[in-house]
Interface confidence: medium
């Protein structure tokens, strides 16, 4: 597919409205402390040299690649020095290596102020002001914060937000409306992007064959009565559609997941029975819709896989010829018969049933070798459901917050080095697992809890890799891919950790304590529940609860006071020495 | 009815290029992923390469990969094999065959072209 100009390609695919976002997006998501304004005037000279290219393939650097072009763009930004350091270095480069610089400096936490949402009347007068600079300024503070972000579907969010604003902006109660759409835009943006986080961690630390397994799983549950030809297929498209992505490029990104969900939609009655209502959609809506796509029913008169892959005389022939074809048969084969199972088990089985395969087929008697392969399965399988079943239990006994504190008292005491606010957003994120998927019945709760177990221990791994601390996080986090939930589950207290020294000012509460949502209360307690752990990791959970009810009784306390401040100074004391009496500190 | 005819087969030296073809008719070909199969004198059947329907992606079998190239013609019901640098060891009946709905079983297979390698 050679063209002349790929900038004037991608721009007459895309059209001018979506090569305008994309190129925003890419840019702050690689220079994530440039303000709005420069951003806007980079993405307005671009856009106004892509449509010299369309008039004229031929004129002057149109046959630069798309990287040369914007690398070049991103190096003209005069406060690069001062601004980002090291990373100006990357500008001394050539293409590809100055793109590769570029994407290592991607911070997945960068020094950003917290997002504030304004009044209502404030938004809905900036968006009847300027809708587009409006909507410019939304993908801008997104793609900034979240440097992984899946830019298509940013451009879907993006669709989103402009409705909510259109409908809401026009309502009796404003306030009604838009509140809980943009909550529900900010709380599935969130998960979008902590999901496409794993999927480029995928890719850039473990490589395009640990994506594609995990690609031929899922599909493979999803699409149960599609041939695996067709699963293969599949599976290439979308390796190449989130390889461009992750890697920066996305431009060609969104036009192959076009095409994709373009291939999908034509060739459907040969894919899912289910994708009729996703295909009626738009291409933004569609192409997300497709994504999230139930599991289609599983055909009725499967055979028993142990013919194909336990006792055919021609196992080790069939691995021989091509290795990964058969594995990737066998993964498919399983795959589509468990939507019971979550990706990652899937994936353990798939290397079980290799490594016994490798052993095997060098054996004296490989058939009586590889003969009860499937045995090896079964603790595999018994310990997620084991976990779930228990953590579920606990979570119905506690309600979120209390299940949040125990995992984060759990966390605490595994990984003490871990900073506060990882170990609080971590634990968060894995105590929501219970509102998540426990409601679901069996069949559905392991896909659910451990798929979902995985995106969030991603983001402590991402987090940590920024700055290490623990030995014992980075083992979990780069030693297998598919094991790093029971890496996690299995680790013990760390008995080499030197508790923290007491530090009273990291007790010690104010009365803006009182004027937070619910939510940013409960972080305030729940770090502080940490910064207890990491002073007193023997502490027991009894110890640590009565601390805690004190605290929730002191702030309620205050709060209620007519002089909250000296509440606080004079209570506060208080509770810290009957805290540290308790504790032992 | 289904059918594949394969041809193309010959002997050749080994180094040597052959082009082997298969037309298909009685199915929707268009909607199928083919592939090569080739059966050694004395050995049991090899799986060589498979295409997807649409043309892309592409595999093949580790002992081919880098010489044999698999692609199809759907306006003609074509399947081909560009087979370059041959080798003694790929002498084969090369059958052309629809691939399998999932399991390791082939649905159809038409009657092989023979190809030699030898000096």
């Known amino acids: 597919d050679a063209h002349k100009s790929e900038v004037a390609h991608r721009f007459k695919d895309l059209g001018e409205e979506n090569f305008k976002a994309l190129v925003l997006i890419a840019f702050a998501q690689y220079l994530q402390q440039c303000p709005f304004e420069d951003h806007v005037k980079l993405v307005n000279e671009v856009t106004e040299f892509a449509k010299t290219c369309v008039a004229d393939e031929s004129a002057e650097n149109c046959d630069k690649s798309l990287h040369t072009l914007f690398g070049d763009k991103l190096c003209t930004v005069a406060t690069l020095r001062e601004t980002y350091g090291e990373m100006a270095d990357c500008c001394a480069k050539q293409e590809p290596e100055r793109n590769e610089c570029f994407l290592q400096h991607k911070d997945d936490n960068p020094n950003l102020p917290r997002l504030v949402r304004p009044e209502v009347d404030v938004m809905c007068t900036a968006f009847h002001d300027n809708e587009e600079t409006f909507l410019k300024k939304y993908l801008y503070e997104i793609a900034r914060r979240h440097p992984y972000f899946y830019a298509p579907e940013l451009l879907f969010f993006a669709k989103r937000y402009k409705a909510a604003f259109t409908e809401c902006c026009q309502a009796a109660d404003k306030a009604a409306c838009l509140l809980p759409k943009l909550d529900e835009l900010r709380d599935e943006g969130k998960a979008s992007s902590a999901k496409q986080r794993l999927k480029c961690a995928s890719l850039q630390k473990f490589g395009e064959r640990a994506f594609k397994a995990w690609a031929v799983a899922r599909l493979s549950q999803r699409f149960p009565k599609a041939e695996f030809a067709e699963v293969s297929k599949l599976v290439t498209d979308l390796t190449k559609v989130h390889t461009e992505c992750c890697h920066g490029d996305l431009l060609e990104c969104a036009d192959d997941r076009a095409d994709l969900a373009k291939y999908i939609c034509e060739n459907q009655d040969s894919i899912s029975s289910k994708l009729k209502e996703c295909c009626e959609k738009p291409l933004l809506e569609k192409s997300h819709c497709i994504a999230e796509v139930e599991n289609d029913e599983m055909p009725a008169d499967l055979p028993s896989l142990a013919a194909d892959f336990v006792e055919s005389k021609d196992v080790c022939k069939n691995y021989a010829e091509a290795k990964d074809v058969f594995l990737g048969m066998f993964l498919y084969e399983y795959a589509r018969r468990h939507p019971d199972y979550s990706v990652v088990l899937l994936l353990r089985l798939a290397k079980t049933y290799e490594t016994t395969l490798e052993k095997c087929c060098a054996a004296a008697d490989p058939h009586e070798c590889y003969a009860k392969v499937f045995d090896e399965f079964k603790p595999l399988v018994e310990e997620p459901q084991n976990l779930i079943k228990q953590n579920c239990e606990l979570f119905e006994q506690l309600g979120e917050y209390k299940f949040q504190n125990a995992l984060l008292v759990r966390y605490t005491k595994k990984v003490p080095q871990v900073s506060t606010p990882t170990l609080v957003e971590v634990s968060r994120n894995l105590g929501k697992v219970g509102s998540k998927c426990c409601k679901h019945p069996e069949a559905k709760r392991m896909p659910c809890a451990e798929d979902y177990l995985s995106v969030v221990l991603n983001q402590l791994c991402v987090l940590h890799e920024k700055t290490p601390v623990s030995d014992r996080v980075t083992k979990c986090c780069t030693e297998s891919l598919v094991n790093r939930r029971p890496c996690f589950s299995a680790l013990e207290v760390d008995e080499t950790y030197v508790p923290k020294e007491f530090n009273a000012e990291t007790f010690t509460f104010h009365a803006d304590i009182c004027t937070l949502s619910e939510k940013e209360r409960q972080i305030k307690k729940q770090t502080a529940l940490v910064e207890l752990v990491k002073h007193k990791p023997k502490a027991t959970k009894e110890q640590l609860k009565a601390v805690m009810d004190d605290f929730a009784a002191f702030v309620e306390k205050c709060c209620k006071a007519d002089d909250k401040e000296t509440c606080f100074a004079e209570e506060g004391k208080k509770l810290v020495a009957a805290s540290q009496a308790a504790l032992g500190l | 009815e289904v059918q594949l005819l394969e041809s193309g087969g010959g002997v050749v030296q080994p180094g040597g290029s052959l082009r082997l073809s298969c037309a298909a008719s009685g199915f929707t070909f268009d909607t199928s992923s083919m592939l090569w199969v080739r059966q050694a004198p004395g050995k049991g059947l090899e799986w060589v390469s498979v295409?997807?329907?649409?043309?892309?992606?592409?595999y093949y079998a580790d002992s081919v990969k880098g010489r044999f190239t698999i692609s199809r013609d759907n306006s003609k019901n074509t399947l081909y094999l560009q087979m370059n640098s041959l080798r003694a060891e790929d002498t084969a009946l090369y059958y052309c065959a629809k691939f399998p709905s999932s399991r390791m079983k082939f649905d159809y297979w038409g009657q092989g072209t023979l190809v030699t390698v030898k000096s």
């Open positions: 295409i997807h329907q649409s043309g892309t992606p592409t």
